[in-house]
């Protein structure tokens, strides 16, 4: 009995390099601590982008990460990654762990392909 | 006998609203006239974006279409669509018809998802 994690397949970063997407899990469990990790997949390698633990009191996460922010509500996390550039285009996976109390559950989404286009520099003002 | 048409699944438009992608067909036939049509699929509807006929002499196409340009070489067409805006994000299909001499062949690619992000306006220069 695993948890199902769903996330959108594609998201476009804004011209400011900000991408937002939801990460949801089901079935919803009465959980005191939920850990959410954002991973980037490049080739066969996974690298951790950011991670946080949400609780009933801590519904705003990723305070230690300048590039990530997120809010938690029931079984949905709204994730935002900022400071993205074209080289950061790639597949970003949302991993959800129901940490406490037991039983421990873990699930991984199929990934959100984030596309980033670098803006053209504005012309110098004379 | 149909021809196989291949095109990339995803392309990002530049910040200037320009998207380029190849459209190739196989098997390669010795053909005097090749007609290439770019179609946009929205829901269950197809709308023609632009079309042109390439010959041995006319290897530059879409001269009648301000938003399309393309070059033809053997069994590959390099397509460029410009003037794209965020609302133009969508699936663009490449249709290839071997017009002459007989036999007539036709094939359609699976489509290229073009993503377009509108650039932020530059601040007014004082």
């Amino acid at each position: 009995e695993a948890i199902q994690v769903t996330q959108p397949s594609v998201v476009l970063a804004s011209s400011h390099g900000v991408a937002s997407f939801p990460c949801e899990y089901s079935p919803s469990h009465n959980t005191d601590e939920v850990r959410v990790t954002v991973l980037r997949q490049t080739n066969d390698q996974m690298t951790e982008v950011c991670a946080t633990t949400f609780t009933e009191k801590n519904t705003v996460g990723f305070l230690d990460y300048p590039f990530c922010s997120g809010t938690f509500n029931e079984s949905r996390v709204n994730l935002t990654i900022q400071g993205l550039r074209a080289v950061d285009t790639g597949l970003y996976l949302c991993k959800v762990e129901l940490m406490y109390p037991p039983p421990y559950f873990v699930g991984m989404g199929n990934g959100t392909q984030i596309y980033v286009i670098d803006p053209e520099p504005c012309p110098d003002s004379d | 006998e149909a021809i196989q048409v291949t095109q990339p699944s995803v392309v990002l438009a530049s910040s200037h609203g320009v998207a380029s992608f190849p459209c190739e067909y196989s098997p390669s036939h010795n053909t005097d006239e090749v007609r290439v049509t770019v179609l946009r699929q929205t829901n269950d509807q197809m709308t023609e974006v632009c079309a042109t006929t390439f010959t041995e002499k006319n290897t530059v196409g879409f001269l009648d279409y301000p938003f399309c340009s393309g070059t033809f070489n053997e069994s590959r067409v390099n397509l460029t669509i410009q003037g794209l805006r965020a609302v133009d994000t969508g699936l663009y299909l490449c249709k290839v018809e071997l017009m002459y001499p007989p036999p007539y062949f036709v094939g359609m690619g699976n489509g290229t998802q073009i993503y377009v992000i509108d650039p932020e306006p530059c601040p007014d220069s004082d």
């Epitope: 601590e33 609780t55 406490y100 039983p103 | -």
Partner: antibody
Framework: EVQLVESGGGLVQPGGSLRLSCAAS????????MHWVRQAPGKGLEWVSG????????SYADSVKGRFTISRDNSKNTLYLQMNSLRAEDTAVYYC?????????????????WGQGTLVTVSS | DIQMTQSPSSLSASVGDRVTITCQAS??????LNWYQQKPGKAPKLLIY???NLETGVPSRFSGSGSGTDFTFTISSLQPEDIATYYC?????????FGQGTKVEIK
């Protein structure tokens, strides 16, 4: 080698207090949920209390709620059980146990590593 | 809390015998049933998790089966080192609860 070593047990009078410690080594302590399980002389196993890896969430058996407090110091890789208002029925060997959380398994529900135990005797 | 009932509470068997212990849950727990071995004066040791999965390093003479409310633990050929008390534990609903144990002795 993954290891848990309990200490702090002993003889205490009813109504007294005792603090048990469990020193962990050989694994990432801060990401592991840790628990206390006790065994009264000649009896079976009873789960007592648990704490999440971060220390932010705790839970207790009804029999000890309000009297026992579980805590952890992740910088010292140590788990604690503060036992107050002790009763004769709290007499037992107290084991600390790691609750397995593995990304190789989508769901886990068992204690995979146990300490050797420390005996707590409540008697006048 | 879910109640776990083990039987028998004790048994005596000869070396080489097949030994079977049963565990019954007060409500259905799917396959979330674990078995531990506890030798005298020692800590419990996980043998089987999720009803039938053998923990790494545990001899293959130990096995488990069952689902729902009724579970079985088997030692296919009893060895002298298997003298211990065996406990089942449900892992379906928190808090985890244990059976009262089955003491296995050699005749």
């Amino acid at each position: 080698e993954v290891q848990l070593v309990e200490s702090g047990g002993g003889l205490v009078q009813p109504g007294g207090s005792l603090r048990l410690s469990c020193a962990a080594s050989g694994f990432t302590f801060s990401s592991s949920s840790m628990h206390w399980v006790r065994q009264a002389p000649g009896k079976g196993l009873e789960w007592v209390s648990g704490i999440s890896g971060s220390g932010g969430s705790t839970s207790y058996a009804d029999s000890v709620k309000g009297r026992f407090t579980i805590s952890r110091d992740n910088s010292k890789n140590t788990l604690y059980l503060q036992m107050n208002s002790l009763r004769a029925e709290d007499t037992a060997v107290y084991y600390c146990a790691r609750y397995l959380m593995s990304f190789n398994l989508t769901r886990t529900s068992w204690f995979d590593v146990w300490g050797q135990g420390t005996l707590v005797t409540v008697s006048s | 809390d879910i109640q776990m009932t083990q039987s028998p509470s004790s048994l005596s068997a000869s070396v080489g015998d097949r030994v079977t212990i049963t565990c019954q849950a007060s409500q259905a727990i799917s396959n979330y049933l674990n078995w531990y071995q506890q030798k005298p004066g020692k800590a419990p040791k996980l043998l089987i998790y999720d009803a039938s999965n053998l923990e790494t390093g545990v001899p293959s003479r130990f096995s488990g089966s069952g689902s729902g409310t009724d579970f079985t633990f088997t030692i296919s050929s009893l060895q002298p080192e298997d003298i211990a008390t065996y406990y089942c534990q449900q892992g379906d609903a928190w808090p985890w609860t244990f059976g009262q144990g089955t003491k296995v002795e050699i005749k």
